[in-house]
């Protein structure tokens, strides 16, 4: 799929759509450009449009392609390759190991939701930046540590 | 086609703390999937003892509480697991394994390195 | 923890038999949503680490005879052999693949007579 970037002429698929709401309803129309793109372009993943308006608001669905049981979403073990399962999950706070004071602030499942909706033209943001989820820890990329816990799921 | 070995000691002494590799081939542990251990003692019971995935998260068998640690070295491609305390419970074959992904169930195996615990 | 239980914990057998075994789960491996079950099989023989044969109750790995049937549904399965050959015989386990951590049967045993 083509991504419209802000320089870029409306591709055979995207039309210019020159005032809010003027796109048919088949397509959808970009925040920022105004152009329309197929609505099926819409929270597909891909970053269509230049502000990434497309992907915004999204549901997550646990793994694109399969369907897992519900009961393993958000129940703190990433099933999925890009752990969607595991993204959007309420407000539980995912606690960096190590020193909360060098670390920064806490970062939020919904948070990272946000960052892959604001991302532009990359791919989908995985756990590979989030240093845990529940009880779950994380291991960095390179190192030999990681903290025993037992799994569990925050409620 | 991803291949994977264990490796590490034969025998452990109680309260000492055990360590085994398990190097993959054809496969980068970081693309996806996650990598598990799971271990089979003398009376062919299989447990499953945690994994970590290819983001870095790891997961735990409750019922080896604070004992477990599994951990990675991207650079080597490998992952490890360390478990404290040992005891002569723990002798048992340990086995490093992969799930297809999006799936619980194992369809890739090492052969599995045998770890006796006696004094 | 999910708890399976598997039964008979040995078979003796002779070549060409049909032989079937049971595995009960504590709790039911059927998901709702997607009607599968969340139940596996694998064969173990001698020296060897345990092989995928069933996955989801009753779908066959690739390349795995279809002399093996998987059925069941809940928390009752079966894994039937339909003619036993020389090379079946192994120790046959049943997994929990629904909810972690992840249990195993103590396996039932195919000897020959």
């Known amino acids: 799929e083509a991504a419209a970037s802000p320089l870029s002429t409306p591709t055979s698929a995207q039309a210019a759509g020159p005032s809010s709401g003027s796109c048919p309803p088949t397509k959808f129309q970009c925040r920022t450009s105004g152009l329309c793109v197929p609505l099926t372009w819409r929270c597909d993943r891909d970053l269509d449009c230049s502000d990434g308006s497309d992907e915004e608001e999204c549901r997550i669905e646990p793994c694109s392609d399969d369907c897992i049981p519900l009961t393993w979403r958000c129940d703190g073990h990433p099933d999925c390759p890009d752990s969607s399962d595991e993204l959007g999950c309420g407000t539980n706070e995912i606690l960096p190991e190590g020193d909360a004071t060098t670390m920064g602030p806490p970062v939020t499942l919904e948070s990272v939701t946000s960052l892959r909706n604001a991302t532009t033209m990359g791919p989908p943001v995985t756990l590979e930046s989030v240093p845990s989820v529940g009880n779950a820890t994380s291991s960095s990329a390179g190192d030999q540590s990681g903290s025993p816990t037992a799994y569990g799921v925050i409620a | 086609d991803v291949q994977l070995q264990e490796s590490g000691p034969d025998l452990v002494k109680p309260s000492q703390s055990l360590s085994i590799t398990c190097t993959v081939t054809?496969?980068?542990?970081?693309?996806?999937?996650?990598w598990h251990w799971i271990r089979q003692f003398p009376g062919n019971k299989l447990e499953w003892m945690g994994y970590?995935?290819?983001?870095?998260?790891?997961n735990y068998n409750p019922s080896l509480k604070s004992r477990i640690s599994i951990t990675r070295d991207t650079s080597k491609n490998q992952f490890f697991l360390h478990l404290s305390s040992m005891t002569n419970e723990d002798t048992a074959t340990y086995y490093c394994?992969?799930?297809?992904?999006?799936?619980?169930?194992?369809?890739?195996w090492g052969a599995g390195t045998t770890v006796t615990v006696s004094s | 923890d999910i708890v399976m239980t598997q039964s008979p914990s040995s078979l003796t057998v002779t070549a060409g038999e049909k032989v079937t075994m049971s595995c009960k789960s504590s709790?039911?491996?059927?998901?709702?949503?997607?009607?599968?079950?969340?139940l596996t099989w694998y064969q173990q023989k001698p020296g060897q680490p345990p092989k995928l044969l069933i996955y989801?109750?009753?779908t066959r790995k690739s390349g795995v005879p279809d002399r093996f049937t998987g059925s069941g549904s809940g928390t009752d399965f079966t894994l039937t052999i339909s003619s036993v050959q020389a090379e079946d015989l192994a120790v046959y386990y049943c997994?929990?693949?629904?909810?972690?951590?992840?249990?195993f049967g103590a396996g039932t045993k195919l000897e020959l007579k």
């Open positions: 394994t992969r799930p297809p992904v999006v799936t619980r169930y194992f369809d890739v």
């Open positions: 054809g496969y980068s542990i970081t693309s996806d999937y996650s």
């Open positions: 970590i995935h290819s983001s870095g998260i790891t």
């Open positions: 709790q039911g491996l059927l998901d709702s949503g997607n009607q599968k079950n969340y």
């Open positions: 989801w109750a009753s």
């Open positions: 997994q929990n693949d629904y909810t972690y951590p992840l249990t």
